[in-house]
Structure formats: structure tokens, C-alpha cells
């Protein structure tokens, strides 16, 4: 079926917004007022994946850019990156595994688990202005809980 997508922004549980930091990196920081316009708008696509009754597979693209969050091994460590794709072929229902995240909703908060690397999550640091990364721990110092705000297309 044609892939179903929605536009949204994400904030971590400390209310930090996500913004571009250079061409291929996201960082998390507190924004207010007009600065909120800096936050990235994601095109969240609902794709095939190891769907369960608790987990919904999604791909996270940057709206109107040919960039997708993907998970790859770098120096033997699961790593989050922004990957450039051919806009003629993406998004698609059958995304490669590295692009797929399991969206998990717990107590009105969202977690995004890598399909490629189970138990690794999109994470932010407690500190301001630090890169968004793939973290292998939940419930520790790093933040793995997010809220989603819908954006009209």
C-alpha cells in the first residue's frame, strides 16, 4: 500500500527540541518563542517491520529533505546518523531495516527503538546543545522518552 506518513515534531521528556546541527546531525536544546521555528519537522512513515501489539514500526525522515534517521555500526558501535536517500524511491512501505524504528508508547511518552539494534534507542543528553544519538541504556542519565506534536501539512 502507499506508505502513510504524518508530519510531527519531537521533544524529549525535558522539553528539549530537536534542531539541525550541520548537514547530517541533530542536536537537542531548549527553544522558546520564535526560535521554535528552528525545530526539525519529521515526516514519520508507517512501514513494514516487526510490528507487535505494543510496537509500531516507523521511519523518520526530515520533512521535504531526502534525509532519514538510520542506524549503522561505526567502529563496532550502533550509531545514529542522518542518511541521504534518492527522493524518487523514498519513503516506501518496505524500508531497509536500518531506517526502521519501533515506536513504543508508554504512559503517554514515546520511545524509538532501533529495529536493526534491539534495545538501542534514540536518545538525548541531559546537557544542552548535544547531539541526538543512539543509546543502549534506558532509565539512566540519558533521555529516551519523547513527546510528539502533530504538524499540519
Amino acid at each position: 500500500a502507499p506508505v502513510r506518513s504524518l508530519n510531527c515534531t519531537l521533544r524529549d521528556s525535558q522539553q528539549k527540541s530537536l534542531v539541525m546541527s550541520g548537514p547530517y546531525e541533530l542536536k537537542a536544546l531548549h527553544l522558546q518563542g520564535q526560535d521554535m521555528e528552528q525545530q526539525v519537522v519529521f515526516s514519520m512513515s508507517f512501514v513494514q517491520g516487526e510490528e507487535s501489539n505494543d510496537k509500531i514500526p516507523v521511519a523518520l525522515g526530515l520533512k521535504e529533505k531526502n534525509l532519514y534517521l538510520s542506524c549503522v555500526l561505526k567502529d563496532d558501535k550502533p550509531t545514529l546518523q542522518l542518511e541521504s536517500v534518492d527522493p524518487k524511491n523514498y519513503p516506501k512501505k518496505k524500508m531497509e531495516k536500518r531506517f526502521v524504528f519501533n515506536k513504543i508508547e508508554i504512559n503517554n511518552k514515546l520511545e524509538f527503538e532501533s529495529a536493526q539494534f534491539p534495545n538501542w534507542y534514540i536518545s538525548t543528553s541531559q546537557a544542552e546543545n548535544m547531539p541526538v544519538f543512539l543509546g543502549g541504556t534506558k532509565g539512566g542519565q540519558d533521555i529516551t522518552d519523547f513527546t510528539m506534536q502533530f504538524v499540519s501539512s
Epitope: 500500500a1 510496537k55 512501505k93 518496505k94 526502521v100
Partner: antibody
């Protein structure tokens, strides 16, 4: 060679729990999902649910409240438990291997067990 | 959930006949259509996946076509061993859903 074999009691009393085991060979349960499907006598096929390599499960809505699918990777076994059974649960129960081909055919089922008939009757 | 409407529910034909079975999905499923053959007392056997891809070892008289919502399964020249029940299955999204089945009988 990929093989799946269902086993369990052929007769279950109403209101009791139906328990079946699917023993697999030729593939690893940590790499491939396994579905359960049932077929009432003389009727069509109904997909029940599945367990993925990760251990996550997806249960079909009509049975969700009564269904538990679990597995033991080391024993190469998947189990199905269906509680509070009635005569309507009488069927041949099959387990089948998911294809798990990311970006190609993730949800299709390629190999099936031979099935086991479960009759619900007092 | 995606509904699959399969027709006909039964079909009488003779050896050598060309036989066609159709399946219609309630929404677009791209090419995520599978066709199974089931003989009495046996498990279903996968013949065709991804709408038209013949499984290894399956005779070339079996074929499938279609995409989106409308799909066709064809046996070009019926053989005695082909008399069985055939089911379509959509594998686009969970829950997986089957067609009602087509029983192919000897005329």
C-alpha cells in the same frame, strides 16, 4: 531442511486452556518469526498471531484477550496458549515460519507444520 | 484490517482446462499477495509469493498476477494432482488475512 511440527492434546474441555507446542528445525527462532493459523473442520484459514525473533508478539484482535504466544529459542519451540476455550475453538492448528525478508517480504509465511487437530468437548 | 474477497468459492473443471481464481483486497496491498494450495488432510503449500513469484519446485503451469487491490491466480492446464483448495493471503500488513478459499473439483 526447514521443518515445523505441532504437538499437544487432541481433546480439551470447554473453559479450559488449549496448549500447543511447535518444534522447529532448519532455522533459528532468534532469526525468524513464527505464526499460528487455525482451520475449523471444513472451513477456511484464520491467522491467530505471531512471535518475532525478538520475542515481541502480535495477536489478532478477536483472540487477543485469550491468547499467549511464547518461545524457547534454545529448545527451538514456540508455544500457543488459548484460554477459556469453547466448541468454536475446535480446529486444526498450524504453525508456520515467517519469511522475514526485510525490504522484500517480511510478513509472508513460507513453511508450515502438518497441523494438529484440537477438539473442544466435554 | 484488510479484507480479502476470493472468488469463486468453488469451481468444477476438467484435466487440461485453464482455470482462473481472483482475489480482491479491501485496500491497496502493492504486490504483497500469496497463493496457497491445500489438499485434504494436509497443510497449505505456498505456490506464489509477491503476487507473481513462483516458489522453487512449483510447476510453471501455475502463475499469478496483479497489484494494488486486484489479483489473479491461473492454472494454465489442469493436471489431476491440481484438484485441491486454493487460498490467497495478503502479507501487506498485520493482521494477516486469507481469502475464503476456492475448492477446485473434477467436472
Amino acid at each position: 531442511e526447514v521443518q515445523l511440527q505441532e504437538s499437544g492434546p487432541g481433546l480439551v474441555k470447554p473453559s479450559e486452556t488449549l496448549s500447543l507446542t511447535c518444534t522447529v528445525s532448519g532455522f533459528s527462532l532468534s532469526d525468524f518469526g513464527v505464526s499460528w493459523i487455525r482451520q475449523p473442520p471444513g472451513k477456511g484459514l484464520e491467522w491467530i498471531g505471531l512471535i518475532w525473533g525478538s520475542g515481541d508478539t502480535y495477536y489478532n484482535s478477536p483472540l487477543k484477550s485469550r491468547l499467549t504466544i511464547s518461545k524457547d529459542n534454545s529448545k527451538s519451540q514456540v508455544s500457543l496458549k488459548l484460554s477459556s476455550v469453547t466448541a468454536a475453538d475446535t480446529a486444526v492448528y498450524y504453525c508456520a515460519k515467517q519469511r522475514n525478508l526485510w525490504g522484500f517480504d517480511l510478513y509472508g509465511m513460507d513453511y508450515w507444520g502438518q497441523g494438529t487437530l484440537v477438539t473442544v468437548s466435554s | 484490517d484488510i479484507q480479502m474477497t476470493q472468488s469463486p468459492s468453488s469451481l468444477s473443471a476438467s484435466v487440461g482446462d485453464r482455470v482462473t481464481i481472483t482475489c480482491q483486497a479491501s485496500q491497496d496491498i502493492d504486490d504483497d499477495m500469496n497463493w496457497y494450495q491445500q489438499k485434504p488432510g494436509k497443510a497449505p503449500k505456498l505456490l506464489i509469493s509477491l503476487a507473481s513469484t513462483l516458489r522453487p519446485g512449483v510447476p510453471s503451469r501455475f502463475s499469478g498476477s496483479g497489484s494494488g487491490t486486484d489479483f489473479t491466480f491461473t492454472i494454465s492446464s489442469l493436471q489431476p494432482e491440481d484438484f485441491a483448495t486454493y487460498y490467497c493471503l495478503q502479507s501487506d500488513s498485520l493482521p494477516l488475512t486469507f481469502g475464503q478459499g476456492t475448492k477446485l473439483e473434477i467436472k
